[in-house]
Interface confidence: medium
């Protein structure tokens, strides 16, 4: 299954498969997640080392039975792969990284404002796939505002140095945020010139262009079919790059097919998994496993659920078979890709869905061993579970916020229902940024059903929560996906990064936005908050956040909305805009329901009708 | 609809205790705080105390601490107030409210009225 | 404690006429201040809250300003339901009512 703990001060011994430098460990994480071997990691901070050549170290790792010893190293950060964690699973990585230099090939230099622009910039131009920034304080004069655009073979830093007054991060490409638009075309019987940067073998050139696609250096592709005239090279996929970013010529060959790397997509990028199957072909690879199941679909799913399984072929030879069972060859290559593919055989093929983001049906959460006022624009993607819930009466208009936990599901909060209990006016904006962009061709989903807390009551802050079950399951992408709920009773976790959103008042008496705002509202004692609302009862199903000074808070129009924390590098949604004395105000805080408090209510309503939990937990 | 129902009028005796209720309907005590006031004879209100019913918590205003005692019973939704060595300063309404929006919703008050 | 000082503690005005009524803080009480209307055998009414945020259903004569440790109340035009005993309260820290003001028609 999928483990999200983060171990502190212990180092995996062993099981090196590759090594690189990354700025921290959630994207040590990330590398080890889209590495085809990685199961474990263990990353070196600046400061947990001397050695200047193993400072911002990533190791990846692999082992057969799925773990490796730990030994103390102080300040060292160990994890797991995100194989097999649906949703979880992203190449994108937003992080800025101040006082750092990520070294690389420099192949473009220009003078910006900010690092957010760099970044910008960097995303938007097809081989960056890193920056460094340095700011207007920093201590060369002529290279202040500089804006590095970088890329190396690896995709990642060829080292890491701590330098000050620079700030450096990641193309936002695997985000689906550039503008650059891509070549959804796959052209027959072309091949494409250039550098190649890899070869490996797949059945079809959709497979090869997602596998370029996730490729650091791929910016296009060559397919050789399986009837191509040399038989050693059917199958082949190269991927390949260019010193312009496109194929410098294209040459007619018959059974070959080529076509560009999809990172560059806008609001949409391929999910970074093959779910086909393929009849009648044989995947060769090394050997994992052999078990019979029935059928195809089981075999894929027994890979799945294998963490180290790749690929898999399931036989039909009469030999291979039991009754109604089969064999059910598990395997697994160095690049993850078939090391043989024959055709015409009594075999079905396919690959592990361990890299697929869509997760099952069900609900997030995680175990571990009223405009925003003071805010700022978000951007697209920042917050993909977000939604927006709006009335539609004679007019239609934005009410509440809430928050997607599963492919059916949305969090909010039970008093954005008051008199308004009917659900057929109701309709659900997912996957937006601007409600101005909403029109009546805009997809919106609409309530099946509106699950209230018992306890809740007309008027009371007690119990502001309720479910809504969507009549028809969302697929999840970069802008549209659910945020993970604690565990259960979580009060030892100390959230120090925590953010809420939504189009609410700017200010008191304001009116709703049109860009989803953000704001950074540090969590506050019950005991402070209680101090500060004397005749209300701040029990522990709540939890307070807010500013002593004010001035940055959530308001009308927010509720039912998500305050998120970031803890572990992982999303948490840890309150639901609740009621508050006001916005902003001087020593008020914004009063949420705790999410906690509520998991067994969730679990309980989230079941499925045939009594299975639908939830999906990463640990 | 939330109302808050006190008991009658009493008419005690120098030195004497009374208790006085308010029972809640609409809402559950245990969800919010229950507070006393008091209001002497042409004079301004005074905060007495508040208590959690879910857990008998009580805050007290300093000056009527040892004069009042504040309790409640959640299976009749009801708060009380026992007041002690009743003497003329103690004459006055006592009204119980409920939190939760700054004294939004009052009792009618209840007439203690202490002569010998 | 915060003492909360009100004046006038009896006023008389003429119907239609403007009604204001101060409250004085011991110390800065952040506007955390509200409003009562109290009327014989009822409990008190809340009116304002939060220095000047009137509640729900109650009309717009009445009104609120104030900051630091010195705040004041107004009805711009007196109707006769007005007639009562007006309270200030201050919810900085704990709760302390003012002495009242008692309104009369002239």
């Known amino acids: 299954g999928c483990l999200t703990q983060l171990y502190e001060n212990a180092f995996f011994r062993g099981g090196d498969v590759a090594s690189m430098y990354t700025p921290n460990a959630q994207y040590c994480q990330m590398r080890c997640t889209f590495h085809p071997r990685c199961l474990l990691f263990s990353f070196l901070p600046a400061s947990s080392i001397n050695d200047m050549e193993k400072r911002f170290g990533c190791f990846l790792k692999d082992s057969v039975t799925g773990t490796l010893p730990k030994v103390h190293r102080t300040g060292a950060v160990s994890g797991h792969s995100l194989k097999q964690c649906g949703h979880q699973i992203s190449a994108c990585h937003r992080d800025i990284y101040k006082g750092v230099d990520m070294r690389g090939v420099n192949f473009n230099v220009s003078k910006v404002s900010s690092v957010e622009e760099c970044q910008k910039r960097c995303t938007s131009n097809i081989r960056c796939q890193f920056f460094s920034y340095a700011t207007q304080t920093f201590h060369k004069a002529e290279y202040r505002n500089n804006c590095l655009l970088k890329y190396s073979p690896g995709g990642t830093p060829t080292a890491i140095k701590v330098l000050s007054n620079v700030e450096s991060g990641f193309s936002l490409k695997p985000c689906a945020l550039s503008e650059i638009g891509c070549h959804m075309n796959i052209f027959q019987h072309l091949a494409f010139s250039d550098v190649d940067v890899a070869r490996v073998l797949t059945p079809d050139a959709f497979v090869c262009r997602t596998i370029c696609t996730y490729h650091p250096n791929c910016l296009f592709f060559t397919f050789y079919t399986n009837v191509w005239k040399i038989e050693s090279q059917r199958n082949v996929c190269l991927l390949k790059t260019s010193e312009s970013g496109t194929p410098s010529s294209s040459t007619p060959q018959e059974n070959t097919i080529s076509g560009y790397s999809l990172l560059t997509c806008k609001r949409t990028l391929p999910e970074p998994c093959h779910s086909k199957i393929y009849p009648g072909v044989d995947f060769g690879g090394e050997e994992l496993n052999v078990t019979f199941v029935k059928g195809v679909n089981v075999c894929q799913e027994t890979c799945t659920k294998m963490i180290r399984c790749q690929f898999f072929t399931y036989s039909l030879l009469p030999e291979d078979c039991k009754e109604e069972k089969c064999k059910c060859f598990l395997r697994l290559s160095m690049d993850g890709s078939p090391t043989r593919i024959a055709y015409g055989t009594q075999g079905s093929s396919g690959y592990s869905l361990r890299l697929c983001n869509t997760g099952d049906n069900s609900v997030c959460t995680t175990k571990t061993s009223t405009r925003i006022v003071g805010g700022t624009n978000s951007s697209w993607g920042e917050w993909p579970w977000q939604v927006s819930l709006q009335v539609k009466l004679t007019a239609q208009r934005h009410l509440c916020g809430g928050s997607l936990i599963g492919h059916q599901w949305v969090l909010t909060a039970a008093h954005c229902f008051d008199g308004l209990p009917l659900q057929d006016v109701w309709r659900i904006y997912s996957g937006i940024l601007n409600l101005s962009d909403i029109t009546k061709d805009t997809p919106f989903s609409q309530i099946k059903e509106i699950i209230i807390h018992q306890n809740y009551k007309v008027s009371e802050g007690n119990h502001d929560i309720a479910l809504i079950k969507l009549q028809a399951p969302l697929n999840y992408t970069e802008f549209q996906k659910p945020i993970c709920l604690p565990s259960k009773g979580d009060t030892s976790t100390i959230y120090t990064n925590c953010w809420v959103t939504g189009w609410g008042f700017s200010k008191e008496k304001g009116e709703i936005q049109n860009i989803l705002q953000k704001v950074n509202i540090p969590l506050v004692t019950n005991e402070e908050c209680q101090k500060r609302y004397q005749d209300y009862k701040i029990t522990q199903r709540m939890v307070c956040a807010g500013y002593k000074e004010g001035g940055k808070d959530a308001c009308k129009g927010d509720s039912g909305g998500p305050l998120v924390c970031k803890h572990n590098g992982m999303w948490r949604l840890v309150g639901i805009t609740s009621w508050g004395e006001g916005c902003a105000r001087r020593e008020q805080p914004g009063v949420y329901t705790k999410v906690a408090e509520y998991m067994d209510w969730i679990l309980e309503k989230t079941q499925s009708s045939d009594g299975k939990a639908q939830m999906q937990s990463p640990a | 609809e939330v109302q808050l129902q006190q008991s009658g009028a009493e008419l005690v005796k120098p030195g004497a205790s009374v208790k006085l209720s308010c029972t809640g309907s609409g809402f559950n005590i245990k969800d919010i705080y229950m507070f006393w006031v008091k209001q002497r004879p042409e004079q301004g209100l005074e905060w007495i105390g508040r208590?959690?019913?879910?857990?008998?918590?009580?805050k007290y205003d300093p000056k009527f601490q040892g004069k009042a005692t504040i309790t409640a019973e959640t299976s009749s939704n009801t708060v009380y107030l026992q007041l002690n060595s009743l003497t003329s300063e103690d004459t006055a309404v006592y009204y119980c409210s409920r939190g939760g929006g700054l004294f939004a919703y009052w009792g009618q008050g209840t007439l203690v009225t202490v002569s010998a | 404690d915060i003492q909360m000082t009100q004046s006038p503690s009896s006023l008389s005005a003429s119907l239609g006429g403007k009604v204001t009524i101060t409250c004085k803080a011991s110390q800065d009480i952040n506007k955390y201040i509200a409003w009562y209307q109290h009327k014989p055998g009822k409990g008190p009414r809340l009116l304002i809250h939060?220095?000047?945020t009137l509640q729900p259903g109650i009309p717009s004569r009445f009104s609120g300003s104030g900051s630091g440790s010195d705040y004041s109340f107004s009805i711009s035009t007196l109707e006769p339901e007005d007639i009562a005993t007006y309270y200030c309260l201050q919810y900085d820290d704990l709760w302390t009512f003012g002495g009242g003001t008692k309104l009369e028609i002239k």
């Open positions: 208590i959690d019913p879910e857990n008998g918590n009580i």
């Open positions: 939060y220095t000047s």
